[in-house]
């Protein structure tokens, strides 16, 4: 609806009256409107609302509103709609970031790696290797490395030390009278041969001579995965290598205990870039195409101390 009344705070603009050639000073129209009729010696300027598909951000003296930008190209979504006061703004949906005028999925940090820096709509996730004492057992674009389960605090012992990719497996020593096998339904995380694990305090070991193996594993490339929920854990890079171990060495009869420890229990830290979280030593790399500084190929450990 045309508006004729000018606010006291509205600025002015100059307009040349075509009929008389006279330079007139008119009141500007408010944002979201345009000048449908300029002022004359005897009348105020007339403002009209911007038609659909157009806008003006500020008070103005223009005769036509600006056209809004084109609809957001897939896969972008509208951050701001086209309205009388605002132009359409496009952004990348959750789990993606703007790259070369389109949206690319956030890098998925592979197993053994955690998120060092969260991704945003304009910046990719940055991954880091889990450091000593931490691990990541699922590919994720939101989760940091998690600290190993503290078996001792649960009055249990470590029957399988954690790696960058697996948590400690806790268990109890059976009584001499009965030998118990792992209870059904509990997962004993397999540790591939030739895998380096993080050092675990010796006080948590019961089986003697059980050192983790060390060597390289080839990196496995996984497809990108979109994740919209941020895990609250922070990475901690504190892993250390242990001596060689005969992976096939049999353990004494130990009972495996379910940890029931979700990522929300974990606190991870980043120190030197790796002071974030780290876990086992198996090589894997963040899944992504050529991207700035994301780890590729080998395992990378930064001095980080992050906590979940």
């Amino acid at each position: 609806q045309p508006e004729q009344k000018a606010s006291n705070l509205i600025g002015t603009y100059r307009h040349v009256d075509r009929a008389t050639g006279q330079v007139l000073t008119c009141d500007k129209c408010p944002a979201g409107t345009y000048v449908s009729e300029h002022c004359t010696n005897t009348s105020l300027r007339v403002c009209s609302s911007c038609p659909v598909g157009t806008f003006t951000r500020h008070e103005n003296g223009i005769e036509k509103c600006h056209d809004c930008s084109q609809p957001c190209p897939w896969p972008m979504i509208e951050k701001l709609p086209c309205a009388a006061l605002t132009d359409r703004e496009c952004t990348c949906p959750p789990g993606m970031f703007q790259s070369n005028a389109t949206c690319a999925p956030h890098t998925v940090c592979p197993v053994g790696w955690g998120v060092r820096k969260k991704g945003t709509e304009t910046e990719d996730v940055r991954c880091k290797q889990c450091a000593r004492g931490t691990f990541s057992d699922v590919p994720s674009s939101v989760m940091k490395c998690k600290a190993y389960t503290d078996c001792l605090s649960q009055n249990l012992v470590v029957i399988k030390p954690g790696t960058k990719e697996t948590d400690n497996v806790c268990g109890t020593l059976p009584s001499f009278s009965s030998s118990t096998s792992p209870s059904p339904g509990t997962a004993i995380f397999p540790r591939p041969e030739h895998m380096e694990t993080h050092e675990v305090p010796s006080s948590t070991y019961v089986p003697k001579g059980m050192n983790s193996t060390e060597s390289n594993s080839s990196a496995s490339v996984r497809p990108k995965v979109l994740s919209s929920i941020q895990e609250g854990t922070v990475p901690d890079n504190t892993s250390s290598a242990r001596g060689k171990e005969d992976v096939n060495k049999t353990l004494p009869n130990l009972q495996v205990v379910n940890h029931q420890q979700g990522p929300h229990h974990r606190h991870i830290l980043k120190l030197l870039p790796s002071m974030e979280a780290t876990g086992g030593e198996k090589s894997s790399t963040p899944i992504k195409g050529p991207k700035r500084g994301h780890p590729r190929q080998n395992l990378h450990k930064h001095f980080d101390i992050n906590e979940h």
Epitope: G133, S240, L271, L272, S274, E281, N298, N306
Partner: antibody, heavy 115, light 110 residues
Framework: EVQLLESGGGLVQPGGSLRLSCAAS????????MSWVRQAPGKGLEWVSS????????LYADSVKGRFTISRDNSKNTLYLQMNSLRAEDTAVYYC????????WGQGTLVTVSS | QSELTQPPSASGTPGQWVTISCSGS????????VYWYQQLPGTAPKLLIY???QRPSGVPDRFSGSKSGTSASLAISGLRSEDEADYYC???????????FGGGTKVTVL
């Protein structure tokens, strides 16, 4: 046994350059993030730079950004720190450290920047 | 000035309990793991505590670490003369996108 041995330190004039090396042994070097941490005489520890295991990503303290370059040669199990445009305040013992947790450190090499 | 604040010194007699504090903020200690390092006179630092409260093998159980909120602490029970050293806390800082160290605490055994 994990061992880290730094070398390359010495006396250099302001504006000069030095290249530090850290020879690693006793572990799978290519699997670890590595870092440089320094300690000025009588002062505390200051993180300088870190590099991923593959060398794919590097991080630098603001105080050395643009002047220092961290790199590694996994085939030689060696970490490097190229230091250019050295200043008096860069005088320190430079340590290399393994892993994000800095679980093992070298014995350090002294860099003195003085005219 | 360090992002992490430690008392410059702490002392105790043999057998006593000494605690060193390390104060930070949400962007560092509050959201990340804390590490502690011991530096004996004239030697390189050594990892003492990782992921807030874990000890590497070889570190006596007299040393314990804890974290609460934006602060962490290192406790030494049954203080011994060989514990005389500088102790540093460290963590990652999300805002700086870098590791940070405390200024260090010199522990003296009286």
């Amino acid at each position: 046994e994990v061992q880290l041995l730094e070398s390359g330190g010495g006396l250099v004039q302001p504006g000069g350059s030095l290249r530090l090396s850290c020879a690693a042994s006793g572990f799978t070097f290519s699997n670890y993030e590595m870092s440089w941490v320094r300690q000025a005489p009588g002062k505390g520890l200051e993180w300088v730079s870190s590099i991923y295991s593959s060398g794919g990503e590097t991080l630098y303290a603001d105080s050395v950004k643009g002047r220092f370059t961290i790199s590694r040669d996994n085939s030689k199990n060696t970490l490097y720190l190229q230091m250019n445009s050295l200043r008096a305040e860069d005088t320190a013992v430079y340590y290399c450290a393994r892993d994000g947790a800095a679980d093992y450190w070298g014995q350090g090499t002294l860099v003195t920047v003085s005219s | 000035q360090s992002e992490l604040t430690q008392p410059p010194s702490a002392s105790g007699t043999p057998g006593q309990w000494v605690t060193i504090s390390c104060s930070g903020s949400t962007s560092n200690i509050g959201n990340n793991y804390v590490y502690w390092y011991q530096q004996l006179p004239g030697t390189a630092p050594k990892l003492l505590i990782y992921t807030n409260n874990q000890r590497p093998s070889g570190v006596p159980d007299r040393f314990s670490g804890s974290k609460s909120g934006t602060s962490a602490s290192l406790a030494i029970s049954g203080l011994r003369s060989e514990d005389e050293a500088d102790y540093y806390c460290a963590t990652w800082d999300d805002s700086l996108y870098a590791p940070v160290f405390g200024g260090g605490t010199k522990v003296t055994v009286l």
